[in-house]
């Protein structure tokens, strides 16, 4: 059995300004039990996008049930999309933990490129 | 404190139904995955059965996959298994076990990984 | 599956070392349950891989490595004597066990 990947497909996506953006990101097992956030940009000053934990995250849906219990398929759309909205988002597993769920595998990450809006 | 009481054993006959019962206090179930262990006379550990802390997401063990079902009362603070067709290798000790992990979303499926609370036990003995 | 000695022995004051072998390095996080009798009530020493749970003496320890977990009692009491069982889960099953250690303290 081996252990959990993040899988990206998608290297980069295009979007037009006020169109929505679907990121997609799948995950090869359902251990280790733990939260799956997005983030644009790495390191420490990313922004964090999505997190299925806890939050309000009024742009973004997911494009799967995540009540499923064997669902693996933690993409999201994000709406309205602005030229501010470009960048590489990456979909970030972490593992429960005590006190803190811990950081645990990252998909590659998605460039999200802002094409103009069509006049 | 967080205790878990289980009730609801005793002698059964093969073939019928039991329903076994554990109440839980000092957490939420809601917040938790709970799941049965049982051990038979003289062996080891086994899983039966477990919920999520999302009420739905519930797993059984092939043993007694489509003759048991777990369900949850959050208002009572309750956990059942439903064991139906019983049969003389479902006697032994049955446990109630507590997942250490808070959940509050879907992710957690119904893993008992970290568990970190037991039952005392109810006895079970399925003879005719 | 998870593979652990079927018993061990130690004099009062030693350390204890209990292994568990996962077949797989997805076993992601491993507990240690003490019952002192059969049928009575398993008492979780480890959980976590490697934390203790309030009430259980700093005695008890625990570590995880890859696919191995191991139990570790530091100045073991007579009281210890008992089964361990190792816990985990993987991908299709929520809870496994280990068949359980024998923990004997001799004199």
């Known amino acids: 059995e081996d252990e959990l990947q993040v899988i990206q497909p998608e290297k980069s996506v295009s979007v037009a300004a006020g169109e929505s953006a679907t990121l997609r990101c799948a995950m090869t097992s359902l251990i280790p039990v733990g939260p799956i956030m997005w983030f644009r940009g790495a390191g420490a000053g990313r922004e964090l996008i999505y997190n299925q934990k806890e939050g309000h995250f009024p742009r973004v849906t997911t494009v799967s049930e995540l009540t499923k219990r064997n669902n693996l398929d933690f993409s999201i759309s994000i709406s309205n999309i602005t030229p501010a909205d470009a960048g590489t988002y990456y979909c970030v597993k972490f593992r429960k933990g005590s006190p803190d769920d811990v950081e645990f595998k990252s998909g590659a990450g998605t460039e999200l490129s802002v094409r103009a809006k069509p006049s | 404190a967080v205790t878990l009481d289980e009730s609801g054993g005793g002698l059964q006959t093969p073939g019928r139904a039991l329903s076994l019962v554990c109440r839980g206090s000092?957490?939420?179930?809601?917040?938790?995955?709970m799941g049965w262990v049982r051990q038979a006379p003289g062996k080891g550990l086994e899983f039966i059965a477990s919920?999520?802390?999302?009420?739905?997401?519930?797993h059984y063990a092939p043993a007694v996959k489509g003759r048991a079902t777990i369900t949850r009362d959050v208002g009572q603070s309750t956990v059942r298994l439903q064991l139906n067709n019983l049969r003389a290798e479902d006697t032994g000790t049955y446990f109630c076990?507590?997942?250490?992990?808070?959940?509050?979303?879907?992710?957690?499926?119904?893993?008992?990984?970290?568990?970190?609370?037991w039952g005392h036990g109810t006895e079970v003995i399925v003879s005719s | 599956a998870l593979t652990q000695p079927s018993s061990v022995s130690a004099n009062p004051g030693e350390t204890v070392k209990i292994t568990c072998s996962g077949d797989?390095?997805?076993?992601?996080?491993y507990g240690w349950y003490q019952q002192k009798s059969p049928g009575s009530a398993p008492v979780t020493v480890i959980?976590?891989?490697?934390k203790r749970p309030s009430g259980i003496p700093s005695r008890f320890s625990g570590s995880a490595s890859g696919s191995t977990a191991t139990l570790i009692i530091t100045g073991v009491q007579v009281e210890d004597e008992a089964v361990y069982f190792c816990?985990?889960?993987?991908?299709?099953?929520?809870?496994?066990f280990g068949a359980g250690t024998t923990l004997t303290v001799l004199g």
């Open positions: 076990a507590k997942d250490a992990y808070q959940c509050s979303y879907a992710t957690c499926n119904d893993y008992l990984d970290t568990i970190d609370a």
């Open positions: 000092g957490f939420s179930i809601s917040s938790y995955n």
């Open positions: 919920i999520g802390s999302d009420g739905s997401s519930t």
């Open positions: 797989n390095s997805a076993h992601y996080y």
């Open positions: 959980y976590y891989n490697d």
């Open positions: 816990g985990s889960a993987d991908s299709s099953n929520p809870a496994i």
